[in-house]
């Protein structure tokens, strides 16, 4: 039994780091393997993660952590019984994938304006709480080409857009994701989407030019 692709890990910079790797053949990850992890710090105990299967030869493990500081470093040991298959280390702050925002709500009761709000996925004592920026994706269920992304580069978890920038009388969906420049994170997963009916009344003579905003990171 050998490791084909070494474990790679990402951290939510709060309580969970997820490590994935591939073995050289079909493996029952939960019965054959154990991933031991330990914070390199005083009094820190070694913890055992029982991996789950992630495809035939793939394994995934969710490492639970009480808290995290920028300087944290973990040792990782992958065992198959008494055999040490791989030894490595992991710095959570260098591999951050933020938690997804939640509670996305579209408020349509403000005249001519759509207000989208969502919740910051971190508590105030977490460094990322004040460092997240967001991307909001809005798309039409009727028209696949009507797909837009708004970049929210301020800290407040909300976005106001004129209802008239969207087509009237059709249903739209929105979702939001987050990232933090300070740790050069990857994007979070998208939040669950929310749906609303855009019933803005267009003035008869008004012509719309739809601008599509694209963001690459």
């Amino acid at each position: 039994m050998k490791v084909l692709q070494e474990p790679t890990c990402v951290s939510d910079y709060m309580s969970i780091s997820t490590c994935e790797w591939k073995m050289n053949g079909p493996t029952n990850c939960s019965t054959e393997l154990r991933l031991l992890y330990q914070l390199v710090f005083l009094l820190s105990e070694a913890h055992t993660c029982i991996p789950e299967n992630n495809g035939g030869a793939g394994c995934v493990c969710h490492l639970l952590m009480d808290d995290v500081v920028s300087a944290d470093n973990y040792t990782l040991d992958l065992w198959a019984g008494q055999q040490l298959l791989w030894k490595g280390s992991f710095k959570p702050s260098e591999h951050v994938k933020p938690r997804a925002p939640g509670n996305l709500t579209v408020h349509t009761n403000v005249s001519d304006t759509l207000l989208l709000t969502w919740s910051n996925p971190y508590p105030p004592d977490n460094y990322l709480y004040n460092h997240l920026t967001y991307a909001v994706n809005i798309w039409s269920e009727n028209d696949p080409a009507d797909f837009r992304i708004y970049n929210v580069t301020y800290l407040e978890p909300s976005l106001r857009i004129a209802a008239s920038t969207l087509k009237s009388g059709i249903s739209y969906r929105a979702r939001v994701r987050a990232w933090a420049q300070c740790y050069n994170t990857t994007w979070s997963e998208w939040s669950p989407s929310t749906k609303w009916h855009n019933s803005y009344r267009e003035p008869f003579e008004q012509h719309h030019h739809h601008h599509h905003h694209h963001h690459h990171h």
């Epitope: 309580s15 969970i16 710090f41 009480d66 500081v69 920028s70 300087a71 971190y122 105030p124 004592d125």
Partner: antibody, heavy 116, light 112 residues
Framework: EVQLVQSGAEVKKPGATVKISCKAS????????MHWVKQAPGKGLEWVGR????????IYASKFQGKATITADTSSDTAYMELSSLRSEDTAVYHC?????????WGQGTLVTVSS | DIVMTQTPLSLSVTPGQPASISCRSS???????????LEWYLQKPGQSPQLLIY???NRFSGVPDRFSGSGSGTDFTLKISRVEAEDVGVYYC?????????FGQGTKLEIK
């Protein structure tokens, strides 16, 4: 041996500012959060605030916002707390504590006396 | 802010007898990561506080096994199975789950 050694007692006049220090040995403060806890004479413990020494991120109890400023110098493994506009109610022993992720190591405390 | 209320505020115990201190939080102290950061500290006369129990039930290294913690939700208890003379001091519960972190008002344990 792990130790947090705090600076000595201070006597200040009302309105003055004091800065007390907490030097860690046996570990690097960048590996922990450094907290400060207030204990007024004959009273209980009161959490003041904390810092992540690596990035300087601080949070405070609302009562101490504007009163306390916590800083840290990772090169000397020292945390500091400055108390401004001192009043008699600020008379207390102030403890520095490292938390990872509980208060395992406490300084011996610094008595700050505010008296005219 | 979460208020931590301890009862009783003082107790006098005969050596060898059990003691129990209750701590109630004004709201849930489950952290967003699922853990409950409820701790117990003892401040012996003239000393800085010392950690006894972390995450509700876990004894810190070097703490005698006569100390135990229990509870969930908003109700927590520290028990000393057989009090010894060296156990005198003020016991504090503490929640480190939600900012601002807060201590209970303290329970003074004396020996009869």
């Amino acid at each position: 041996e792990v130790q947090l050694v705090q600076s000595g007692a201070e006597v200040k006049k009302p309105g003055a500012t004091v800065k007390i220090s907490c030097k860690a040995s046996g570990f690097n403060i960048k590996d922990t959060y450094m907290h400060w806890v207030k204990q007024a004479p004959g009273k209980g413990l009161e959490w003041v605030g904390r810092i992540d020494p690596t990035n300087g991120y601080t949070i405070y109890a609302s009562k101490f916002q504007g009163k306390a400023t916590i800083t840290a110098d990772t090169s000397s493994d020292t945390a500091y707390m400055e108390l401004s506009s001192l009043r008699s109610e600020d008379t207390a022993v102030y403890h520095c504590v490292s938390r990872r992720p509980w208060f395992a190591y406490w300084g011996q405390g610094t008595l700050v006396t505010v008296s005219s | 802010d979460i208020v931590m209320t301890q009862t009783p505020l003082s107790l006098s115990v005969t050596p060898g007898q059990p003691a129990s201190i209750s701590c109630r939080s004004s709201q849930s102290i489950v952290h967003s990561n699922g853990n409950t950061y409820l701790e117990w500290y003892l401040q012996k006369p003239g000393q800085s506080p010392q950690l006894l129990i972390y995450k509700v039930t876990n004894r810190f290294s070097g703490v005698p096994d006569r100390f135990s913690g229990s509870g969930s939700g908003t109700d927590f208890t520290l028990k000393i199975s057989r009090v010894e003379a060296e156990d005198v001091g003020v016991y504090y519960c503490f929640q480190g789950s939600h900012v601002p972190y807060t201590f209970g008002q303290g329970t003074k344990l004396e020996i009869k």
